[in-house]
Amino acid sequence: EAHKSEIAHRYNDLGEQHFKGLVLIAFSQYLQKCSYDEHAKLVQEVTDFAKTCVADESAANCDKSLHTLFGDKLCAIPNLRENYGELADCCTKQEPERNECFLQHKDDNPSLPPFERPEAEAMCTSFKENPTTFMGHYLHEVARRHPYFYAPELLYYAEQYNEILTQCCAEADKESCLTPKLDGVKEKALVSSVRQRMKCSSMQKFGERAFKAWAVARLSQTFPNADFAEITKLATDLTKVNKECCHGDLLECADDRAELAKYMCENQATISSKLQTCCDKPLLKKAHCLSEVEHDTMPADLPAIAADFVEDQEVCKNYAEAKDVFLGTFLYEYSRRHPDYSVSLLLRLAKKYEATLEKCCAEANPPACYGTVLAEFQPLVEEPKNLVKTNCDLYEKLGEYGFQNAILVRYTQKAPQVSTPTLVEAARNLGRVGTKCCTLPEDQRLPCVEDYLSAILNRVCLLHEKTPVSEHVTKCCSGSLVERRPCFSALTVDETYVPKEFKAETFTFHSDICTLPEKEKQIKKQTALAELVKHKPKATAEQLKTVMDDFAQFLDTCCKAADKDTCFSTEGPNLVTRCKDALA
């Protein structure tokens, strides 16, 4: 239904707290360099204006679209061109082009310092002094670093943060209470960020149809007892919610997400038997819980997939009558039978089935042609299964850090032209798949591994798009989203690469490395490892292990030495010489 004032409608639906949080996220995701105070001022102005519209929907400007209202606010910021360069040109455009322009200027890798967590005491002091401002800072800092973070989900993480601080700041040992809990939230939020970015990429590059196919597969796996009409309705609604969030329409997105959660809880009987626990929770927790609810039990009496999609003489007729519906039904039926497959794999199978029908239905005897289609799925299924087995075996043997290093070597060989920081970030993220997925039961490993890897590789593609340097990466990133992971896996050593010359300074370290936190130490060592591979792309695993062991020993010795600086300056050059010899 149309509302006289869109802003009043959203304010009423969402309530002041969520309204302000979402407006802050929106502004922080569009203008990523502005300070918290600048954005907080704008948020307050927008909120005050929304309140005047609630009081009188006919008041001046209350009938304007949210894009117009928000865009006008952003464009009124002083020194916009000095701080944001060509983004200021967006302000010369009219809606909807202006909003599109803002979206195009979102930076996936903004040059902002890493978000450092203050020490426990300081954190608790500022939290107690002003919880609202403290949470505002959290939303601002996360949103500006992750310009596509799923806004209603970010409100959920802020709520989690709030609960942890409330609990831990009352403890005697604040540090040991806060650290593991906040680390857990941070890890989950980072995974949520890359997953949502993948959804927005799907929407941006391949349109709503591609995202809806993803949603149908995912929902069918989770709700195998829901019928196709129900899954289609949920997928359509979920597509709308994600389209809005990806498009910067955060108030509409959060409002529609709340509506979808309400619908699901009111229709549990036709959706799933597993929803009740989620539905008992308050809004943000409810929506979050529904998004990762466990799979319902599969119906026991499902007929073989072949009956309707291979053996039926009507296959081509049904396909001709409604291609998308027929393929959607296939995806639904296949997905509900395979919670053990990744969504990416299910979409590849649906694509293979579509290609088979396109070819076979044009023949004189289609059934003879498409009769073997299910057997042709076998290699497509085996490939990711082998990937999971090989990688989980390696993870179990090496542990997370060693596994990350193995991946780093592999990916540096595949795309040595990519910058070392990007390779290290990617390898560290890809390597976490072991800890995240390899410990799960067998039937959950494949969906966990492949869908997580796909999301991480999407980030690799986004970063590479800004400065394309590797033909290998360009090739894999320009294909369809579901083919990316197999494409990257299939890449081998880039034979066109001219090895980097050996620079001693790249491998020169100083005593300051000794006081770094373990994570930072690992990054330094992994940076050196990537540089070694760039110098000797065909170095054997044994050679690289020798060098890295020597390097670790050197760090250990010098960091324990009484005179660290002397140790580093005398032993460092010896290490460099030994490295060169080992790789010669």
Epitope: Q313, E314, A320, C361, A362
Partner: nanobody, 115 residues
Amino acid sequence: EVQLVESGGGLVQPGNSLRLSCAASGFTFSSFGMSWVRQAPGKGLEWVSSISGSGDDTLYADSVKGRFTISRDNAKTTLYLQMNSLRPEDTAVYYCTIGGSLSPSSQGTLVTVSS
């Protein structure tokens, strides 16, 4: 919406000829193989002939081989069945179908072969 409309049926004497047409709409005609099936009075459906989307591959039931010719005009989205040397046992309602379908969704056209 997919629509198939058959025409060209009628009463003919044994040994004579008829040409059936099937006008198709609502789908990408050239992307689909097409078939003719028939149903004689009091009998089940019987497959007669099929043709690929491009028109360069054809199949016939043994009972009509050498007498019937299937063809298509993709520009006009029309399927044809040229029936020569008709026999009384060819009497049936003829339907065009998409792909290998044996269940017609159209009205069909009646062919009666009788002296």
